[in-house]
């Protein structure tokens, strides 16, 4: 029967008793930096050629004892995983290794660099197709190796990386940190993240998404035949780059951005028990597992989104915090995040010719977050229109004034550090559509944008109890892009997307304050594509 | 996602003039050295010398023999065991810890990352 | 689904060599670690030892100078012997599957899920 | 060789008790521990593993804790089926080594 790994991530309406995906990623190339391999196991036999680059540190101790089978344990089991006869996820790709792991699963930093380069040079004197990059390793965050993956990746290569085994952030490890790498955390059969003993699944906002990556059946180096239960999260970055060469060879023209989008897109939604993972991090970790795209990988023209977290700003009162998109991407909207609830807005700037969301710390703060809602939005043109604060109890309006410009997503600054004087802004959709309305001392910041079919319409929902959070979401066929809370009383946290789901948060000690008339508001943008259609804004 | 983490980096403590070679005095360094926050994991002795986006690659070999040079001027043998052109411009070099402030002096240079471990996951 | 079944002679001589074999059925022998259990009447488990696919083989040392534990592929099975019997070895014998994953972080790591399957035992009397 | 040590050796209880076992390690096993169920003429079956980790199909009603050196098994609600014997298995080396067993009796 199908192992649980593999009808994991297959479509339910796909699912039989053999695991037969549409599509075996035949047009695609996987290279593994790993250990060496049994390249002659029946599972990978013709599927993998091992290059002669080898980059590897001696083995600790003296009496170190070099076993085949012991050294080629781990990138054999990754092979398979990718594209092994019976237990792989694309039966058609084909691979190459390149040995930057010793027999004791270790390798260096500048081992991986050069492998990275010679995969760079292969691609440069001999142009092929689509190139998956699989780096099912990780060591302490390394400023010159993400710099290498984000060459790379901007040289079109797909480079697909373990979260990491630590139970910890994946933002203190490389190349999981790097924003151009797609980083995979793991979760079990139950669809829990993954913990063995002390190790377990690395989390975080430098996480993409999970895939299955514990008790995985793969290729054994112990004999031709021989098949072994290896766990990890490198073992989940396999199951993802198999299936990003299915995607690669049915669209061979994907962009990374398009890629990472997609499979974000296709993945199960809130399947994961958020609360293994510790109480800062829950809202940072994305709660999706991979899974392949039904067997026409069009999205339906639906816009595709997806939320980025920044660092942590730190508590200094003038500590700001950047979300950026990926360079194809559009930011639609920027939105923030304090779990003290003391923060100064959020707004768009331009920083080296890309827009990027920032967010402000106030007085007293513990810190923000800022979060970016980043869209694929074919032949867009998209500007920020904002106003300066108003006067004290004025409201200040801003709209998209450029014809067929729709309004994506409102962010709000203030320059008071007293938050108690302040009313906190939002979008109010029923008296000015389609404009976002800052009050006392707030400045106003209208994301625009004009791109062909884009419709959009702001959906709000009120909660007038007490509650921690209030949520809106956006139907089936639309997209969320941006989202707002307007509080009920003085103290909200701020607001972030999760899928399609827009979360306003309150701090507890408001909820007390509360009176039965101020409803606390979440407020979404919602928009869809329709390219036959015009622009427009939907009432 | 791009922010640098628990991580180490150090402006180098410099003297403004060494040996009193014009040439090296004339650079201040502005570059920085960066290590692993994971003690066990570090490397001492080998080093990744990045050089700034736009260097050429002429540059890069320059750069990495007025190293050597230099080193040699002051009784360290340095051993340069990989030249890197095509993702970015750069060097791995062996050598002594004591040569890390020369080293960040030398035009071009925009970091120095100590060599560390990585793991199969 | 997955099954074992023991086999052998019920009855064996003192000073003679016990012969068990374990025939695995509804998956392939080649993933699993494959063991070997005792249970005197009346009295706890005791573990002998166990084969991997690749011949791979790990013995609890009380036994390990009169245990061999072989595995037959092609039929899908595997086999204890114990030479040199007494009636103290006189028991249930089961055989049993062990779920174990490797996971690394710094280094490996071998992790089990425990013994999820076994065999309904075999008793094996030793007397003359 | 690790020993491991269980208590109570017998336990009388009657069917919706609330019944608690406790499994020593001689030296800290982490959370490398496996319960298992065991009826006359029948052989053992995997309850828990890793301590806590409850076996697909076992019901609900039992649950692990623990770690290091001591460990339960309870039973929160004593059906007819589970009058049985209970090992614990630790799992953390080989030899794989068992505790001597619990018998739960009916009252």
């Known amino acids: 029967s199908i192992p649980w790994n593999l009808e994991r991530i297959t479509p339910p309406r796909y699912r039989a008793d053999e695991y037969q995906p549409p599509d075996g990623g035949s047009l695609v190339e996987v290279y593994l930096l790993d250990t060496s391999i049994q390249s002659d196991h029946r599972e990978i036999e013709g599927r993998v050629m091992v290059t002669d680059f080898e980059n590897v540190p001696e083995e600790d101790g003296t009496r170190f004892h070099r076993q085949a089978s012991k050294c080629d344990s781990h990138g054999t089991h990754l092979a398979g995983v990718v594209s092994g006869r019976d237990a792989g996820v694309a039966k058609g790709a084909s691979m190459r290794s390149l040995r930057v792991l010793n027999c004791q699963g270790k390798g260096t930093v500048s081992g991986t660099l050069i492998g990275l380069e010679f995969i760079r040079k292969s691609q440069l004197v001999q142009p092929v197709g689509p190139l998956v990059v699989l780096l099912p390793l990780a060591g302490g965050y390394s400023r010159v190796l993400n710099a290498a993956c984000q060459r790379l990746a901007r040289a079109g290569v797909v480079l697909v990386t373990a979260a990491g085994n630590f139970r910890d952030d994946a933002c203190l490890y490389s190349p999981a940190s790097a924003p151009e790498v797609i980083t995979v955390g793991a979760t079990n059969a139950q669809d829990q993240p993954v913990t063995l003993g002390t190790l377990g699944t690395n989390f975080g906002r430098c996480v993409d998404l999970f895939a299955p990556g514990e008790d995985i059946i793969g290729a054994s180096s112990d004999c031709s035949t021989c098949f072994v239960s290896q766990s990890g999260t490198s073992q989940a970055a396999a199951h993802v780059a198999g299936i990003a060469a299915m995607m690669l060879s049915a669209e061979p023209e994907l962009t990374l951005a398009e890629l990472r989008q997609r499979l974000i897109h296709f993945s199960a939604k809130d399947v994961i028990n958020m609360a293994w993972f510790p109480e800062d991090q829950q809202v940072l970790t994305p709660n999706l597992v991979a899974t392949l795209p039904p067997s026409t990988h069009e999205t339906g023209g639906q816009l595709l989104c997806r939320t980025v977290w920044s660092a942590h700003s730190g508590p200094t009162r003038t500590a700001t915090a950047t979300a950026r998109c990926a360079p194809e991407e559009e930011l639609l909207s920027c939105s923030s995040f304090s779990r003290s609830g003391r923060r100064r807005g959020d707004w768009i700037e331009a920083i080296g010719g890309q827009q990027v969301c920032k967010a402000l710390n106030a007085f007293g703060g513990e810190g923000v977050y800022a979060v970016a809602r980043c869209c694929l939005v074919p032949r867009a043109n998209c500007s920020i229109h904002n106003t300066p604060a108003a006067r004290a109890g004025l409201e200040t309006h801003v709209h998209c004034h450029q014809k067929d410009h729709v309004l994506t997503g409102c962010s709000f600054h203030w320059e008071v550090e007293d938050l108690s004087v302040r009313r906190q802004p939002a979008l109010r959709s029923r008296r000015q559509p389609g404009q976002c309305v800052g009050h006392q001392a707030a400045s106003v910041y209208a994301s625009c944008c004009h791109a062909p079919g884009l419709e959009c319409k702001i959906k709000e929902h009120g909660i007038s109890g007490p509650s921690e959070q209030v949520t809106v979401a956006c139907e089936a066929g639309w997209t969320l892009t941006g989202c707002n809370v307007l509080p009920g009383a003085s103290l909200t946290l701020g607001a972030y997307s999760v899928d399609n789901l827009c979360v306003a948060r309150v701090h507890d000690t408001a909820r007390a304050d509360r009176t039965s008339g101020e409803a606390t508001v979440a407020a979404a943008i919602c928009c869809r594509s329709r390219p036959s259609a015009k622009a427009s804004w939907v009432q | 996602q791009d922010e640098d983490g628990d991580y180490e980096e150090l402006m180098l403590a410099l003297p403004s003039q060494e040996d009193g070679l014009a040439d090296e005095a004339a650079h201040v360094a502005t570059a920085t050295f960066r290590r692993c926050s994971k003690e066990a994991w570090r490397l001492p002795g080998t080093y990744i010398v990045v050089l700034m986006e736009e260097t050429q690659r002429l540059q890069i070999e320059q750069t990495a023999h007025r190293l050597q040079t230099r080193a040699a001027r002051r009784g360290y043998v340095i051993k340069v065991l990989h030249i890197f052109y095509d993702l970015f411009p750069g060097f791995l070099v062996k050598m002594s810890s004591d040569l890390l402030g020369l080293a960040l002096k030398l035009p071009h240079v925009e970091y120095i990352e100590e060599d560390s471990f990585v793991f199969a996951q | 689904q997955v099954q074992l079944q023991e086999s052998g002679p019920g009855l064996v001589k003192p000073s003679e060599t016990l012969s068990l074999t374990c025939t695995v059925s509804?998956?392939?022998?080649?993933?699993?670690?494959w063991s070997w259990f005792r249970q005197p009447p009346g009295k706890g488990l005791e573990w002998i030892g166990y084969?991997?696919?690749?011949?791979?083989?790990n013995y609890n040392p009380s036994l390990k100078s009169r245990v061999t534990i072989s595995i037959d592929t092609p039929r899908n099975q595997f086999s204890l012997k114990l030479i040199s019997v007494t009636a103290a070895d006189t028991a249930v014998y089961y055989c049993?599957?062990?779920?174990?994953?490797?996971?690394?972080?710094?280094?490996?790591?071998?992790?089990?899920?425990?013994?999820?399957?076994w065999g309904q035992g075999t008793t094996v009397t030793v007397s003359s | 060789d690790i020993q491991m040590t269980q208590s109570p050796s017998f336990l009388s209880a009657s069917v919706g008790d609330r019944v608690t076992i406790t499994c020593w390690a001689s030296?800290?096993?982490?959370?490398?521990l496996a319960w298992y169920q065991q009826k006359p003429g029948i052989a053992p079956k995997l309850l828990i593993y890793?301590?806590?980790t409850l076996q697909s199909g076992v019901p609900s009603r039992f649950g692990g804790s623990g770690s290091g050196t001591e460990f339960t098994l309870t039973i929160s609600s004593l059906q007819p089926e589970d009058f049985a014997t209970y090992y614990c298995q630790q799992l953390n080396s080989y030899p794989r080594t068992f505790g001597q067993g619990t018998k739960v009796e009916i009252k």
């Open positions: 890793a301590a806590s």
């Open positions: 509804g998956d392939s022998i080649n993933t699993y670690y």
């Open positions: 049993a599957r062990e779920r174990i994953t490797m996971i690394r972080g710094v280094t490996l790591y071998y992790y089990s899920y425990g013994m999820d399957v």
């Open positions: 084969i991997y696919y690749s011949g791979t083989t």
């Open positions: 030296q800290d096993i982490s959370s490398y």
